[in-house]
Structures are given as C-alpha cells and as structure tokens.
C-alpha cells in the first residue's frame, strides 16, 4: 500500500503591485495532481511581517491571496498543499512547505525618514496629514506623499502640499470617494542631493482618525424644580447622529465641575434652587458603533445661564 504524497505549490511568491503595502501572495498548482482530480485540493497559507510573533493562517482553494502589510518591515510567508481526508480514504495529507520572503530594500538611514506623522480626517470630510522632516536632513530634502486604497487604479501623489521653508511638511487630500472602512495606505518618500532618504509606510482606516466639529446650538430647559435639561445639536456635516458620543463639562457657580459622557444630544442635570450660575461646554467624538477609534472635537462655545429664575429661561447660543 503506497504512501500518498503531494507536492508543494510551485512558484510561490509575494508580488508588490505598487499599492504601498497591499500585496499579492500567489502560487501555481503543485505537479502531479492527476490522482486527485476528482478532489478539491486546498492550500494552507501562513504569513506575517518579520518580527511579528504570530502568523496569519488562511486555508483557500484559490491560487492567490491579498492582504495588507507594513512595508517598513520585511514579510515572510509559507504555503503547503492539503489533501482533505476525503481524497485519501483516511487522514489529511500535507505537502512540505514552500517559503518566500519580500522586503523593500531600504535607502538611507532610519533618521532621514519623516518624523511625527499625524493624520486627521476632519469631520469625516477632509484628510490632512502632517509630518516633520527627518533628523539632520538638509533643506534641499523634499518629501513626497503617495496614497492608495481599494478602488483606486494606482497609487496617487499628493497634489496639495503644506510647505514650510520650501519643504513639504504635510498634505491636504482631495475628496476621497468611498475611502472609509478599508485600509488606507500611505508612503512618504524623499529625495536629496546630499544623501538617500528612507521611505516610511503608514496604514490606517479613515473612520478611525475622524475629528468631528464641536456640537452647536447649546440650550437650557427647566424640566422641574431640581432638574435642568441641557441640549445641543449635532455638528454640521456628513456624520449621522447615531455615530456620536459626547463629553460635557458643566460648571455650577464656578465651583462644582461635572463631566459626563453621553450618547444623546441631551443631558439632565440635577440642581438646587441655590444655583446662581450654570455653564457648560460639549465636545463630540465618533463612537464605537461607527469606528474603532477617534479624536475628540474641540470644545463647543461655552453656554451660560446667570440669574434667579431659570424656569423662565431657555437660552440659545
């Protein structure tokens, strides 16, 4: 009874289509699959950035797989052929591993790459990234930003740079159609007559770096002798109400400070009849239902009530 063997896939490689970190892993079928032609061969693929402790594992019937990687580091991957037990009248048969690696040959020393890269998606409308030049680079050094996300045919270069002393230190992006809830890839490379400049790669999702506008139209309403309802409106723009969390800061008579986080555009505050002055500010942030992370907006303008008869007042800013 001869032992059943299967060969590993052929021509296993990692292909960089120029999407700044979104890579293709592809391979060809193993040789000598005739004995199993009535059977669907599967492939177990493992891959990771070099330095990562854990492998990502995929089992697929396809001859390719695509995923995003950090091109600041190398990538390693391995694959083998799987014959399910149905094909072999017994246990699963695996081939030996085929292995491959990929990395971008680094130019320049690490200190020449951009420092303190910071990207903010203002009000879910306008993306702005800024950075500082690398350490010890000369003024003739210029940095260029390229970006890609699924939906673009190819990586695009920034067309509206923010400059300081003639150097590019940021990018104002154009309208980015259908760009959220998917990986957004950025490369900032550079050129200098003096020395080579190290490229930097960044990946994030736009909905996770949103900084909304602050809430507007803050008002007070007396609900009862000991309750005041604070109300405000969602900021103008494309972010729906269901996506907001709010933080309120309330100051009573310049002494008591109340902070609260709420999900709605109202907050009921218990007060005493002795309250002479009430001020509050609100800020907004995209909540966990719409993103994994976010940036608090600036605080709204302060809205205050001063006087004796709060029951007769509905203040509108």
């Amino acid at each position: 009874d001869t032992e059943i063997k299967v060969n590993p896939p052929q021509d296993f490689e990692i292909v960089d289509p120029g999407y700044l970190g979104y890579l293709y892993l592809q391979w060809q079928p193993p040789l000598s699959l005739d004995h199993f032609k009535e059977c669907t061969v599967e492939y177990e693929l493992k891959y990771r950035n070099i330095g990562s402790e854990t492998w990502k594992t995929i089992i697929t019937k396809n001859l390719h797989y695509k995923d995003g990687f950090d091109l600041n580091k190398g990538i390693e991957a391995k694959i083998h052929t799987l014959l399910p037990w149905q094909c072999t009248n017994g246990s699963e048969v695996q081939s030996s591993w085929a292995e491959t690696t990929y990395w971008i040959s680094p130019q320049g020393i690490p200190e020449t790459k951009v420092q303190d890269m910071d990207c903010v998606y203002y009000n879910w409308q306008y993306l702005l990234c800024s950075w500082k030049p690398g350490i010890g680079v000369l003024l003739d050094t210029n940095y260029n930003l390229f970006y890609w996300y699924e939906g673009l045919d190819h990586a695009l270069q920034c067309v509206d740079y923010i400059k300081a002393d003639g150097q590019n230190i940021g990018c104002r992006f154009p309208y980015l159609e259908a760009s959220d809830y998917k990986d957004f890839y950025i490369c900032v490379n550079g050129s200098s007559e003096n020395k080579p400049i190290r490229s930097s790669y960044f990946t994030f999702q736009l909905q996770n770096i949103v900084k909304p506008l602050p809430p507007v139209y803050l008002t007070f309403t007396r609900e009862s002798s000991c309750e005041i309802k604070l109300k405000w409106s969602i900021p103008l723009g494309p972010i729906p109400a269901r996506c907001f969390d709010y933080e309120i800061e309330i100051r009573e008579d310049d002494t008591t400070l109340v902070t609260a986080t709420v999900e709605n555009e109202t907050y009921t505050l218990k007060t005493t009849n002795e309250t002479r002055q009430l001020c509050f500010v609100v800020r907004s942030k995209v909540n966990i239902y719409c993103s994994d992370d976010g940036i608090w907006s600036e605080w709204s303008d302060k809205q205050c009530w001063e006087g004796e008869d709060l029951s007769k007042k509905t203040l509108l800013r």
Epitope: Q10, D11, E13, I14, V15, D16, P17, Y24, Q26, Q28, P29, L31, S32, L33, D34, H35, K37, L63, H64, T100
Partner: antibody, heavy 118, light 107 residues
C-alpha cells in the same frame, strides 16, 4: 479583453543582441506568469522562457539558457526577452503568451519575426 | 525532457466528418496537457487545458481526453474554419514541450 501586443520585426547579425517586448492589457498583469514561444520558418512550436507573475522565478530550456533573459515590468505591464549571441538557428517568429492559473498558455501575442542573418 | 509525439502528422478530413489526433508523452504528465490550434498565418489559439477542459469560447465540437501518457483531441464534425495545425503541449515539468503538430486539411 486580454491583449498582448508585441514589438516589430528585427533583423540582426549573428552574435548580436536584441530585446523583444510584449505589452499586455485587459488583465492584472502581475497575477500571471508569462512565456515566450518561438516558431522557426515552416516548423513547430518551441518553448523558450517562462517568468512567474512577480518575476521571482524564471525557466529556460538548455538551448537558450545563458543567452536569453526573460524579464517583466509590472508597473507598465510589459514582458521582455533579451536575446544575446544570436545564431542563425534562432531565426523564428517569437510569440509571447500568458500562463493561465493552471499553467497552460491561454492568450498569445501576434508574434515578432526575428531574422538572424549575415 | 518529456517528448510529445503526435500522430498523424497530416490529417485529411471530409467536411462534417469527425477527426481524431493522438498525442503520446514519453513519461507520465498526469493531466497537464493543453491543445492549440494554429490557423495559417495566425498565432496559436487555445483549445483545451488539463487534458479535457475546453476554454470558454471554444466550440463544443472540440473535446479532449486522456491522462498519464496518452491524450486525444477529437473534432466531432470538421468545419472549414478548422483547417490548420494542431499542437499538444505538456506543462507538467520544465522544459515545457510541444508535439510536432498535426496538419488538418479538407479532403
């Protein structure tokens, strides 16, 4: 639709070099291996080179190994073959062909006639 | 190297009649065989891959069969546009090799 457009005919002297090109369109070029196949006048087909989608793997028969080099530029979707130390028996129509995902050749270019003659 | 031997080398056929071309491999190539048609003055055109699978757009009068070392291309009813040279090719192992070609002509 898939198209493979090859460069024009070449006439070269024995011992000379020439570089053929094949511009691809209508598919994700980097996902497919590519091959060159030649056909001497009145003869059958002879495989001369294959390159994998990412360019990591190249294959040649003994008859051209060391003289022919297959390369690709995925950024421009172009396949190349540089042929050095050409001999009269290298005279042929050279076809580029796409390797499908089962390793067979599914689409072919229109061919480039290379004539090696003194 | 795997030698692919085709027979016959010339195949005169009456229009509407069937035609069959044989291809024998010198060693086992499993089902890793393709068939191509080359009409006069044209580039080769794909017909069959993996011994028996027809490419899309290929008329169903073309069929392939076989595995291991013996392979066959059949045309159920020959039409005028089928005139040309037919090649088998193995892609089981490098170097890739073709048969010598079978010239199909109308009687």
């Amino acid at each position: 639709q898939v198209q493979l457009v090859q460069s024009g005919a070449e006439v070269v002297k024995p011992g000379a070099s020439v570089k053929l090109s094949c511009k691809a369109s209508g598919f994700t070029f980097s996902s497919y291996g590519m091959s060159w196949v030649r056909q001497a006048p009145g003869q059958g087909l002879e495989w001369v080179a294959t390159i994998s989608g990412g360019g990591s793997y190249t294959y040649y028969p003994e008859s051209v190994k060391g003289r022919f080099t297959i390369t690709r530029d995925n950024s421009t979707s172009t396949l190349y073959m540089e042929m050095r130390s050409l001999r009269s028996d290298d005279t042929a129509v050279y076809y580029c062909a796409r390797r499908d995902l089962r390793s067979a050749m599914d689409y072919w270019g229109q061919g480039t006639l290379v004539t090696v003659s003194s | 190297d795997v030698v692919m031997t085709q027979s016959p080398l010339s195949l005169p056929v009456t229009l509407g009649q069937p035609a069959s071309i044989s291809c024998k491999a010198s060693q086992n190539v499993d089902i890793n065989v393709a068939w191509f048609q080359q009409r006069p003055g044209q580039s080769p055109r794909r017909l069959i891959y993996s011994a028996s699978y027809r490419y899309s757009g290929v008329p169903d009068r073309f069929s392939g069969s076989g595995s291991g070392t013996d392979f066959t291309l059949k045309i159920s009813r020959v039409e005028a546009e089928d005139v040309g040279v037919y090649y088998c090719q193995q892609y089981n192992a490098y170097p890739l090799t073709f048969g010598q070609g079978t010239k199909l002509e109308i009687k």
